[in-house]
Interface confidence: medium
């Protein structure tokens, strides 16, 4: 027995790997972390690695747990433990020289860089208060917010965040569907264009005043977020050009010729005033209607008894109970109505401060032979972006049998955000009314300029003797086109046998926005299923796809490939494409050097290893040959003198031989021309228990032999004429196979060092 | 076939974080496909809470988004929940379930 | 988030009666709807996949029907053992969602 002992010699130099510098915020104090600034020393240990410092020129450098002390010398082990700080003052970009040291060697004139970032500070102005409507929408402004920043941010990259939504309306954007999802995000540029809306929407019970909020969070990275609370006040208070009316409800009233009606709160309604009383007090309050300027062709009665000036007044209450009536005094159609000033009125009919109001009612008087128009039902109007289409009547049209079609007249109450109406010979600018003749003449076109979603027309149609009737309209803006995007196949890890599809497999794009798209199975794959929750499915959507909801499994591990086709359909329209599927081997493939021209090499785990594929299945990976090499062949070889010479060709092989060292890759040269460099590659098929097959290709570099040069490999042969150089003569076998004793002349052998050198050289 | 096995506290104290793991036996957890956890508060619901899939994807409910994180540990075949800052209405029984198969539920209780 | 209203939310029922209940969901689901059944102080159990696919050993006396919205969980025959409480959950959207329950109870 002898022993060896090994001393340590320092005789490798330290490198410097990472050199990237310090962003940190202006005099702020940040460790300099070990991803910015790390060395690596193949025989020292990261606390011999010493960096010393001179005089930073923006800041100083500390320890934690020391930030008074500067320093002027760290290690590696200190970066790695995140206690080397750096503190800045000065310049905002700056640095410090540095060099670095194992004990033994140094390397100097190395700089790292510090860089400091102003702070950038966020602020909101305006009033954060909209004043709205009730029922109505209400863009935010700049008034209402307005979004800044000390750095002057472009507006577009100042994104408001809605963290709690409204409660009593919703907020959406004009350009975007305006009945889908509620908005999330918005930017202060879509504030200052007034495309952030609010909408109010209108509650079963009546009420003067109603307060919501929105929380929102405003960010634009670097800059801390700033949180925002927007107050809105919904009231009847306010003067609003869509909403004439300040009570709960003033529609009017139809009465036939001659006749009477009664007058309910469905046309006369004021309780919105009386819900400014708390409602404990309600019930002891009332709303008191005086009449101004009576009816010019009818009475007004209050149960039953008329009302004049000397009793011009009503109340709420009456209203409620069905007491108050309109009778028309014949004599004629003529428009009729009555002004009224209606206030609150307190217990005991006192009069007390609150919301008033004076208004007027109108009556419209009807000919007792006019028979009101009939709707017919309506197709939607369906056209693509950017195009006009005209209105037919399979979209508007009424049966009337006593009204020419000029006499129906139809008015938009709510337009969409799609587009607009236009009359041909009318201007360019949308209309707002327009007759049945203009619809039977093809002059009534719909201009599809605004976003790309469905959207409705809310109309009023009336023969001007009947009450207006509601109808409405709808538009749905097609694409002109959809295309499946299909930017990569879909790659399954072999271990795992299946894999997430995303919108690098599937994605639509249009002409518009990009639309919520549905798939279809329509050719399955062959060799597995698609699942959407782990479980078979035939359909899914893109949303689906973008949560990584449809996953692709193999259930057949018999192919390395698979593909199925899908068509999607998107608003109407659809495309169809074809998914690759393949699987990504788990093998681990050699990378390095070329590799000696006319030698064999051996063929092991530093080169192609399946091992962890082996652990993850537990069973031994087999790999074929489909391809290759070009120059050369792959052998399997005698491991010892005794077993019989020659080697075989191999085109199928095991992990395990691979492990044993039984193989080896002869390393052709090129033909028919100059001795260089040159490249070549083997394609193999891996195969393993449970999982689906993968072709993986080892490509590799090869060169003439240099007896001179280290390679990183274990060489089992090197060309004869090298051998002879090298005073070993040695003769190949009568397959032109090598002696399995032959090596490098200067072995480098392998990852495996020594051991691998005595192993590939001691086998006899 | 399948079997998951909750563990972990009883008992937590309040803004303190919960912690529970997910032992899977009879597969392993890079063979299903949505390994979640579940909570059911006395007497009402089922309540998802999130999930980490075969691949090491992550999603969660977004009314605890903030809160929890779900992760795993493929060498001892668990997955495992933490859900920070509790509450009393964080009292509950938490599940951890594939859909195909459900651990038996462990109580957690938030009290100090 | 997709809302799922179950109903009733409690029914009684005799031993050899039919069940039905349904599963309302606030959007379309495409069919991604799973029905669990769930014992006092168990873990629910998977009945019912993909709105009418039985799970492995589950009773036939169990079926799942519906589309768009609208889901029905039915026990043609109700037996001793399926007196509990059933969920339906989507997945057809994140968050997954389930229905606040359904409980059977012997008449």
């Known amino acids: 027995a002898f022993t060896v002992t090994v001393l340590p010699v320092n005789d490798q130099p330290p490198i410097l790997t990472t050199n990237t510098g310090l962003q940190m915020w202006e005099g702020a104090t940040a460790p300099i972390p070990a991803e910015a600034l790390r060395s690596t020393d193949g025989d020292s240990g990261s606390e011999d690695l010493v960096y010393t410092i001179e005089q930073p020129s923006n800041g100083r450098v500390v320890l934690r747990g020391a930030p008074g002390t500067e320093v002027r010398s760290f290690t590696q082990a200190q970066l790695d433990g995140g206690l080397v700080l750096f503190s800045h003052r000065g310049t905002l970009d700056g640095g410090f020289r540095f060099r670095l040291s194992d004990g033994e060697h140094t390397s100097p004139g190395h700089f790292f860089r510090v860089t400091a970032q102003k702070q950038v500070l966020l602020s909101l102005k305006g009033s954060q208060t909209l004043t709205v409507c009730p029922g109505s929408v209400q863009p935010l402004s700049s008034q209402t917010l307005r979004a800044s920043s000390s750095a002057g941010t472009d507006p577009q990259l100042l994104l408001y965040r809605v963290v709690r939504g409204p409660q009593l309306g919703r907020l959406f954007h004009a350009q975007q569907d305006s009945t889908g999802e509620a908005l999330v995000n918005f930017t202060q540029a879509e504030v200052y264009a007034g495309n952030i809306l609010y909408e109010h929407e209108m509650p079963p019970e009546p009420f003067w005043e109603a307060h919501d909020t929105l929380e929102l969070q405003l960010s634009s990275p670097p800059a801390r977020d700033v949180a925002a609370t927007l107050a809105v006040a919904v009231s009847f208070e306010a003067a609003c050009p869509q909403r004439p009316s300040h009570l709960w409800k003033n529609k009017g009233l139809w009465v036939p010729e001659g006749q009477r009606a009664r007058i309910t709160v469905a046309a006369l309604d004021a309780s919105n005033l009386l819900a400014s009383v708390p409602s404990p007090q309600r019930s002891e309050h009332d709303v008191l209607f005086q009449v101004t300027q009576f009816p010019s062709r009818g009475q007004l009665l209050v149960s039953e008894e008329p009302l004049h000036a000397g009793q011009p007044h009503f109340l709420q209450s009456q209203l409620a109970a069905g007491q108050l009536v309109y009778a028309h005094g014949g004599g004629g159609t003529q428009q009729d109505g009555f002004h009224f000033r209606a206030h609150l009125q307190g217990p005991a009919g006192a009069s007390v401060a609150g919301p008033q109001t004076s208004e007027a009612f109108a009556i419209t008087v009807r000919d007792v032979n006019e028979r009101p128009p009939q709707p017919q039902a309506s197709v939607p109007l369906r056209l693509t972006r950017g195009s006009r289409a005209p209105i037919s009547r399979a979209q508007l049209s009424v049966v009337d049998p006593d009204s020419a079609p000029g006499e129906i007249e139809y008015e938009v109450q709510r337009a969409p955000h799609n587009g607009f109406l236009s009359l041909v010979g009318g201007g360019l600018g949308p209309v707002t009314r327009f007759t049945q003749a203009d619809v039977d003449s093809g002059r009534l076109a719909f201009v599809a300029n605004g976003s790309s979603v469905a959207g409705i027309f809310q109309l009023s149609m009336s023969d001007g003797a009947s009450p207006p009737l509601p109808m409405s309209l709808a538009v749905d803006i097609l694409p002109s086109a959809i295309e499946v995007q299909l930017r990569a196949p879909l790659e399954v890890p072999q271990a795992l046998g299946r894999s997430s599809l995303s919108q690098q497999q599937l994605r639509v794009v249009s002409d518009r926005e990009e639309p919520e798209a549905a798939y279809r199975l329509i050719q399955g794959p062959q060799y597995g299923h698609l699942l959407v929750g782990g479980r078979p499915t035939s359909a899914f959507s893109q949303f689906q796809i973008d949560q990584g909801e449809v996953v692709f499994a193999f259930t057949n591990f018999s192919s390395s490939h698979d593909h199925f086709r899908v068509l999607a359909l998107a608003r109407g329209v659809n495309a169809s494409a074809v998914v690759n599927v393949t699987v990504r081997a788990l093998l681990h493939v050699w990378a390095g050097g070329p590799w000696p021209q006319g030698a064999t090499l051996r063929l092991d785990p530093t080169v192609l290893d399946a091992g962890e594929l082996a652990n993850r299945t537990g069973s031994v990976p087999r790999f074929r040959l489909l391809e290759g090499p070009r120059h050369g062949r792959v052998v399997r070889v005698p491991r010892a003198r005794t077993e019989p010479g020659g080697s075989q060709l191999v085109e199928q092989f095991t992990q395990q031989d691979l492990e044993d060292g039984r193989l080896g890759l002869e390393v052709g040269r090129p033909e028919g021309r100059a001795p260089g460099p040159a490249g070549d590659s083997l394609t193999l098929e891996l195969w393993a228990q449970g999982v689906p097959p993968a072709v993986a290709s080892l490509d590799f570099a090869t060169e003439p032999y240099n007896a001179a040069r280290p390679y990183s490999v274990a060489l089992l042969s090197v060309p004869e004429a090298a051998r002879t150089e090298a005073g070993k003569p040695e003769s190949s076998t009568p397959t032109g196979e090598p002696g399995p004793m032959a090596s490098s002349p200067e072995p480098a052998v392998a990852k495996g060092g020594f051991l691998s050198f005595l192993e590939a050289n001691m086998f006899s | 076939q399948v079997q998951l096995q909750e563990s972990g506290p009883g008992l937590v104290k309040p803004s303190q974080t919960l912690s529970l793991t997910c032992t899977v036996s009879?597969?392993?957890?890079?063979?299903?496909?949505?390994w979640n956890w579940i909570r059911q508060h006395p007497g009402k619901g089922l309540e998802w809470i999130g999930y980490?899939?075969?691949?090491?994807?992550?999603n969660y409910n977004p009314s605890l988004k903030s809160r929890v994180t779900i992760s795993r540990d493929t060498s001892k075949n668990q997955f495992s929940l933490k859900l920070s800052s509790v509450t009393a209405a964080d009292t509950a029984v938490y599940y951890c379930?594939?859909?195909?198969?459900w651990g038996q539920g462990t109580l957690v209780t938030v009290s100090s | 988030d997709i809302q799922m209203t179950q109903s009733p939310s409690s029914l009684s029922a005799s031993v050899g009666d039919r069940v039905t209940i349904t599963c309302r969901a606030s959007?379309?689901?495409?069919?991604?709807l799973n029905w669990y059944q769930q014992k006092p102080g168990k873990a629910p159990k998977l009945l019912i996949y993909?709105?009418?696919s039985l799970h492995s050993g589950v009773p036939s006396r169990f079926s799942g029907s519906g589309s768009g919205t609208d889901f029905t969980l039915t026990i043609s025959s109700l037996q001793p053992e399926d007196f509990a409480t059933y969920h339906c959950?989507?997945?057809?959207?994140?968050?997954?969602?389930f229905g606040q329950g359904t409980k059977v109870e012997i008449k």
């Open positions: 379930a594939d859909f195909d198969y």
């Open positions: 009879g597969g392993s957890i890079t063979d299903g496909y949505y």
């Open positions: 980490i899939t075969f691949d090491g994807r992550n």
């Open positions: 959007y379309g689901i495409r069919g991604y």
């Open positions: 993909y709105t009418s």
């Open positions: 959950q989507q997945y057809s959207a994140l968050p997954w969602t």
